[in-house]
């Protein structure tokens, strides 16, 4: 991390543009020139964390599945009594089969009725949802995509005309600073422009603004 960035973090007011020291700083400064640079997580650590999260998720899913199995078992044990065939004669077994078949038929009837109710409810929900959309004037939410964008472009997009003033003010501040540190920055020139050019930000910015 560049020394200037840690100083900037301690400053209450906007810090001056840092002196060119390390090329790895550029992208960070281009996107967040006045914020403290966050420490980067190494790829191996990222992978480790991802694996850990996946493991936790897997364990959670397994636990949920186990809970569901247990719940199903409990439900079945209350609904389906164990077969107590010891000592029952052929007559009783036949009778029992008839009883169980009758029970199955009854459960099937109940299941059919419940399915009919569910279907009716689904249809009603669909109708009501449609009515809600009709009342909203058939408004459709746009699908949001992640866009890589510079802070300035974002400001411009969010604030519109007011952002222009903010940008001009920033440019003015830079000019004042430039006079103070002209020697140091002569080689660098306008570092923001350089970075925008390097990262293709200028083109993106124009596209975004248009």
């Amino acid at each position: 991390m560049a020394d200037g960035s840690s100083d900037a973090a301690r400053e209450p007011r906007p810090a001056p543009a840092p002196i060119r020291r390390r090329s790895s700083n550029y992208r960070a400064y281009a996107t967040e020139p006045h914020a403290k640079k966050k420490s980067k997580i190494s790829a191996s650590r990222k992978l480790q964390l991802k694996t850990l999260l996946l493991q936790i998720a897997k364990q959670e899913l397994e636990r949920e599945a186990e809970e569901r199995r247990g719940e199903k078992g409990r439900a079945l044990s209350t609904r389906c009594q164990p077969l107590e065939l010891a000592g029952l004669g052929f007559a009783e077994l036949q009778d029992l089969c008839r009883q169980l078949h009758a029970r199955v038929d009854k459960v099937d009837e109940e299941r059919y009725d419940i399915e009919a109710k569910v279907t009716k409810n689904i249809t009603e929900i669909a109708d009501l949802t449609q009515k809600i959309f009709d009342l909203r004037g058939k408004f459709k939410r746009p699908t949001l995509r992640r866009v890589r964008i510079s802070a300035d472009a974002m400001m411009q997009a969010l604030l519109g005309a007011r952002a222009k003033e903010s940008l001009d003010l920033r440019a003015h501040l830079k000019q004042v600073k430039k006079e103070d540190t002209e020697k140091e920055n002569r080689e660098v020139g306008d570092w923001r422009k350089n970075i925008d050019a390097l990262s293709g930000m200028e083109g993106r910015k124009k596209k975004f603004e248009s």
Partner: antibody, heavy 120, light 113 residues
């Protein structure tokens, strides 16, 4: 030695209720299906009710269905017969009987019986 | 319901004689899957409770003397006492264990001459 001992019989008026008990010993009560069988004064034998080893399955003839209830308490090794809305034709000697082993058939053991008299 | 018909209703025999009693069912008691006939025979001596003699139409219960022999299949069954003894004086009932309601025959009374 298998022993079945009925109790609870007596004289009751038509429409009355009575609860018979059968205390079992000499075998693993909870492993066997049990039944009540009655014998009329004319010596005719009538099957009254059957209950499975754990009490989940119950069987009755139409003549007593809805009036009589068979139950068991495996912890106490006792079989019960709750008799409601008694009629004069229910007058009989009531026997509790243990079913045979699963690979066999018939009522292997019978108690000495308890007499139920339904009369005004 | 399966109706069980026993005959004769009573018979008088002398000790040592052979006796045969009959039991007919209104429908077959044969379970085709195991080829077993679900019929039992019981003996009830005066003042006592019934005692199982034979099950599956021909299988003697343990402890039952060999003189008692059950036969038959389908709807026709017999119980034969090869040599009647004084202690055999009793009522004999057949019972079907094929379907509910379980039903008994009216019985055959064995008396001694």
């Amino acid at each position: 030695e298998v022993k079945l001992e009925e109790s609870g019989g007596g004289l009751v008026k038509p429409g009355g209720t009575l609860k018979l008990s059968c205390a079992a010993s000499g075998f693993t009560f909870s492993s066997y299906a049990m039944s009540w069988v009655r014998q009329t004064p004319e010596k005719r034998l009538d099957w009254v009710a059957t209950i499975s080893s754990g009490g989940s399955y119950i069987f009755y003839p139409d003549s007593v269905k809805g009036r009589f209830t068979i139950s068991r308490d495996n912890a106490r090794n006792t079989l019960y017969l709750q008799m409601n809305s008694l009629r004069s034709e229910d007058t009989a000697m009531y026997y509790c009987a243990r079913h045979h082993n699963p690979d066999k058939s018939g009522f292997a053991y019978w108690g000495q019986g308890t007499l139920v008299t339904v009369s005004a | 319901d399966i109706v069980m018909t026993q005959s004769p209703s009573s018979l008088a025999m002398s000790v040592g004689q052979k006796v045969t009693m009959s039991c007919k069912s209104s429908q077959s008691l044969l379970n085709s899957s195991n080829q077993k006939n679900y019929l039992a025979w019981y003996q009830q001596k005066p003042g006592q409770s019934p005692k199982l003699l034979v099950y599956f139409a021909s299988t003697r219960e343990s402890g039952v003397p060999k003189r008692f022999k059950g036969k038959g299949k389908g709807t026709k069954f017999t119980l034969t006492i090869s040599s009647v003894q004084a202690e055999d004086l009793a009522d004999y009932f057949c019972q079907q264990h094929y379907s509910t309601p379980l039903t008994f025959g009216a019985g055959t009374k064995l008396e001694l001459k």
